[in-house]
Interface confidence: medium
């Protein structure tokens, strides 16, 4: 039978009844244009929602936006555009909330075409109230955050100047004019390219890169002859041009860019192009792109300075510059990611890694799922996930991957179950143990979110009719209750549900159509009666992350340590509640081979774990060195794995060796840098 | 009903050598990692040695490193620990015990007796 | 290595007193602790494990609390049959290590 009508299924008693009691139906006096939501603060309730409407006239478009707020998680909103003076806001910046629970907000106007500059609205207390200012400038970007002051704003203008705030907007000034790119790294500090010729685009691969920390009163230029940057975890990148010829190469700092050293990643010619695809404080995922149109590159994976790689993963799906990919971070689970590799036949097949990339896998079969067509071997296949590409690709996939932090081991996703990712209307998996077995969920597409910290789970079917049924299941989607919200159907446009899964408010948004006008409607359920008590000891049980033996003591070892986590069983119907934190208690595992990478100049034999030294290191790999202050690198040709926590057991000693003699480079020097002062 | 049976105890001159073993029976002993725990006389417990249950991995405490050997046959449900270049503080009532996944040692031998003496 | 200290070394109580025994460690340990029985003649028997849990099959008046250094095993209501010594061990990394032990006597 399909998931969800066995025998077992044990109903939610009374759920019609006490979900009619907590279902809060919205009308919002609006013709249908776009409606865009955000949440201001955690765990405050309260919700801005902005719809525009554009009625094209003959000569401009006229716009009308409207603001709501709402401080019961959408339960109730109120009209509040009389506050931002019934003005026209700008969908494309979208609304600025600030960082944490600063309670700040910042809403960019639309002005007329003859202005001095531009307008925001801004609020400090949770969009209770807006203060209009005008600015001595047009914005080209959405106002950026300092991520440790949330007075401290910075705006890219339209004539590429740099503009920074110190007093949450209030007054404005230009520290730096000829600005492709501005972005906040720690402690304040603003990066950002500089042009000195033309255009942003005409000096691409001649920008300086400059840096501030005392925003805008002294700068230092970093790097010269730079094509892009980026900022991931401790890690400041830039690629650079080489001297003699259009490739360019990745080099890196952890000092905020006093010192660079190259990264020991191929360089990369005009047309490709290197991509962070994820970056903590120990390492860093690099996507580099193959020659040509492939469509395809490969993963490497940084050791804890960001300089020495490891080829993490060939073959890896990523479509042109800024393209698609399909590379999920699993939060559920630590060590777990999830992305798409283009295989010689053209195919699309989803590969898992548990350790950080250090050895990828196909997904295993779901139990309960039969091989599709794509398999040549109907008893032998994997489960292929839809993500990003697939949703570019308009396949009929409404929602990416889904996972959790507090929501430990679960995953949902979009997925169909063969060889290949198939382009057949695919179903709803789910994973509660972090991605080693799967179930199917749902059949067909669906949206889904998880509430409640995994307590609940609900789900739409995406269809092309109005819809009316919402899914919920209290035990991590193996049984599921239907609930019809509304009489009367809705055009179903999306599920918004509070970040961070802590919420048991779910809102369902459409619009309803009638002969003559079309309307914005929500409707927000509070699954609080459904788990009626709150969670206790009893509803708990132990798990063991990653387990795959459960009987060994090894078991469950990644990145050099255990975790068990106390998980909520799935037969308990209860409330984790907002304050829920997910207990865990790691142990240390002993130290194997396992939990070293090969140092530069060192690499892995195929089938040994033993890193051993490269006969010469000749041609272009001679580029591949560490610099600094210091030339020369010291190594035992062993280095931990970033984030290895591992203690003991195995200890790699090596003979010391200077590879000073085997260096040659030109790189971001620091006599190539200099300082001035406003 | 599980059990844990050690043997193998008995006098040794110092320097000399003794194997200890420990029948397994009433579990899957194939799927436990299996510890070494000794107890000397009106001393506290310490611990040995532990093996994984594929027996790929053995970890010993300092004190018996590169002396002892912890290891194990699955086709026979036993454990065995070779001890070497014994000396008089290796005096102790030597227990198995086994070692689920959550590293706990949940079930014990009676223990045997190892004396080193001139 | 990580030192385990137990207290008290011995106590004297009688049937149905709550009898409390704790164990510091030397260094944070979460909660990788188990609490062992040992009675004359007989095998050790594991209790406690993860500093809560209490092994299928022991009576419900065990139970352990505490995380990161500091453990409690509570005996609620001493029986007859618990006059024995109890031990505590952590296993958060190795060598694995002991407590010296608390001894239950009848007073």
């Known amino acids: 039978s399909a998931p969800g009508e066995d025998e077992e299924c044990g109903r939610v008693r009374d759920f019609v009844a006490k979900l009619a009691n907590n279902t809060h139906q919205h009308v919002f006096d609006d013709l249908r244009g776009s409606v865009s939501l955000s949440w201001v603060g955690d765990s405050t309730g309260v919700i801005l929602v902005l719809t525009t409407f554009h009625v094209p006239l003959v000569i401009m478009t006229f716009g009308q936006s409207k603001l709501y707020r709402s401080e019961d998680y959408g339960k109730n909103f109120k009209d509040i555009t009389d506050l931002i003076n019934n003005t026209f806001i700008r969908t494309e910046f979208g609304m600025a909330i600030g960082p944490e629970n600063s309670g700040k907000v910042v809403l960019t106007a639309e002005v007329s075409g003859g202005s001095r500059g531009g307008r925001i609205f801004r609020s400090s207390d949770f969009a209770k109230n807006f203060v209009q200012t005008d600015l001595p400038f047009h914005p080209l970007t959405q106002m950026m955050y300092s991520p440790q002051n949330s007075d401290y704003l910075l705006a890219l203008s339209t004539e590429n100047g740099l503009w920074v705030s110190k007093n949450f907007g209030g007054k404005w000034e230009e520290i730096h004019k000829a600005v492709c790119l501005a972005k906040w790294g720690s402690d304040n500090t603003i990066f950002f390219t500089t042009y000195a010729n033309g255009s942003c685009k005409a000096d691409l691969g001649a920008l300086e890169l400059w840096r501030t920390s005392d925003l805008g009163k002294s700068f230092k230029t970093i790097g010269v002859k730079i094509y892009s940057f980026g900022l991931g975890g401790r890690f400041l990148f830039a690629s650079v041009m080489a001297d003699k010829d259009t490739t360019r190469r990745i080099h890196v700092s952890t000092d905020q860019g006093d010192t660079w050293s190259m990264a020991q990643l191929p360089s990369v010619g005009q047309e490709q192009f290197y991509s962070i695809l994820a970056a903590n404080d120990d390492m860093v995922f690099m996507h580099v792109d193959e020659p040509g149109d492939t469509g395809f590159g490969t993963i490497f994976t940084s050791d804890d300075r960001g300089i020495v790689y490891s080829k993490s993963l060939d073959r890896h799906l990523y479509t042109t510059t800024g393209g698609e990919t399909d590379f999920t971070n699993v939060t559920s689970l630590r060590g777990v990611y999830i992305t798409s590799v283009l295989s010689e036949d053209n195919s699309i097949q989803t590969m898992i890694t548990f350790d950080q990339g250090g050895r990828w896998t196909h997904l295993r079969k779901p139990e309960n799922s039969e091989c599709d067509a794509t398999a040549k071997n109907k008893n032998e296949c994997s489960l292929h996930i839809h993500a990003s590409y697939s949703i570019s690709q308009k396949l009929n996939v409404p929602m990416a991957p889904l996972s959790e932090p507090n929501a430990v081991g679960i995953v949902i996703a979009h997925g169909s179950v063969g060889d290949a990712i198939s382009v057949m209307v695919p179903d709803v998996y789910i994973s509660d143990d972090g991605g080693y077995s799967w179930t199917k969920m749902l059949e067909g597409p669906h949206y889904y979110t998880i509430l409640d910290s995994g307590g609940i789970i609900v789900a739409i079917e995406h269809s092309s009719r109005p819809i009316n049924v919402i899914k919920f299941s209290t035990d991590e989607g193996q049984c599921w209750q239907t609930y019809t919200f509304t009489r009367d159907p809705i055009y179903f446009t999306g599920l918004a549900s509070e970040p961070g899964a802590r919420s048991m408010n779910i809102s369902i948004w459409g619009f309803t159509e009638s002969f003559l006008t079309s309307q914005w409607v929500s409707y927000t359920i509070d699954f609080k009666d459904i788990l009626e008590r709150n969670c206790e000891e009893k509803d708990y049980t132990i798990w063991l992350a990653h387990s795959t033996d459960p009987e060994d003591y090894e078991d469950g070892c990644i990145l050099g340590y255990k975790e068990q986590f106390l998980r909520l069983r799935k037969s308990s119907v209860c409330q984790n509640g907002r304050d829920y934190v997910v207990t865990k208690q790691p142990s240390i595992c002993l130290c194997s081979l396992e939990d070293f990478l090969c140092d530069f100049g060192y690499y892995r034999p195929e089938n040994d774990s033993k890193c051993v030294e490269q006969p010469e290191l000749k041609g272009h790999d001679l580029e591949f060195c560490l610099y600094g202050r210091e030339e020369h690198l010291t190594t035992n040709g062993y280095r931990k794995i970033p984030g290895d926590k591992c203690q003991g057991g195995v200890n790699p000693v090596r003979e010391v060796k200077d590879l000073k003699k085997k260096c040659t480079s030109n790189f971001l020097s620091p006599e190539k840098q200099n300082s001035k002062s406003n | 009903e599980v059990q844990l049976v050690e043997s193998g105890g008995g006098l040794v001159q110092p320097g000399g050598s003794l194997r200890l073993s420990c029948a397994a029976s009433?579990?899957?002993?194939?799927?436990?990692?299996m510890s070494w725990v000794r107890q000397a006389p009106g001393k506290g417990l310490e611990w040995v040695a532990i093996?994984?249950?594929?027996?790929?991995?053995?970890y010993y405490s300092d004190t018996v490193k590169g002396r002892f050997t912890i290891s194990r046959d699955n086709s026979k449900n036993s454990l065995y620990l070779q001890m070497n270049s014994l000396r008089a503080e290796d005096t102790a009532v030597y227990y198995c015990?086994?070692?689920?996944?959550?590293?706990?040692?949940?079930?014990w031998g009676q223990g045997t007796l190892v004396t080193v003496s001139s | 290595d990580i030192q385990m200290t137990q207290s008290p070394s011995s106590l004297s109580a009688s049937v149905g007193d709550r009898v409390t025994i704790t164990c510091h460690a030397s260094?944070?340990?979460?909660?990788?602790i188990g609490w062992l029985q040992q009675k004359p003649g007989k095998a050790f028997k594991g209790l406690i494990y993860?500093?809560?849990n209490l092994k299928d099959g022991v009576p419900s008046r065990f139970s352990g609390s505490g995380s990161g250094a500091d453990f409690t095993l509570t005996i609620s209501s001493l029986q007859p049959e618990d006059f024995a010594t109890y031990f505590c061990?952590?296993?958060?990394?190795?060598?694995?290590?002991f407590g010296g032990g608390t001894k239950v006597e009848i007073r």
């Open positions: 093996i994984s249950s594929g027996g790929s991995y053995t």
């Open positions: 260094q944070g340990i979460s909660s990788n």
């Open positions: 009433g579990f899957t002993f194939s799927t436990y990692g």
């Open positions: 993860h500093g809560t």
């Open positions: 015990s086994r070692s689920s996944s959550h590293w706990y040692f949940d079930v």
């Open positions: 061990v952590q296993y958060a990394q190795f060598p694995y290590t």
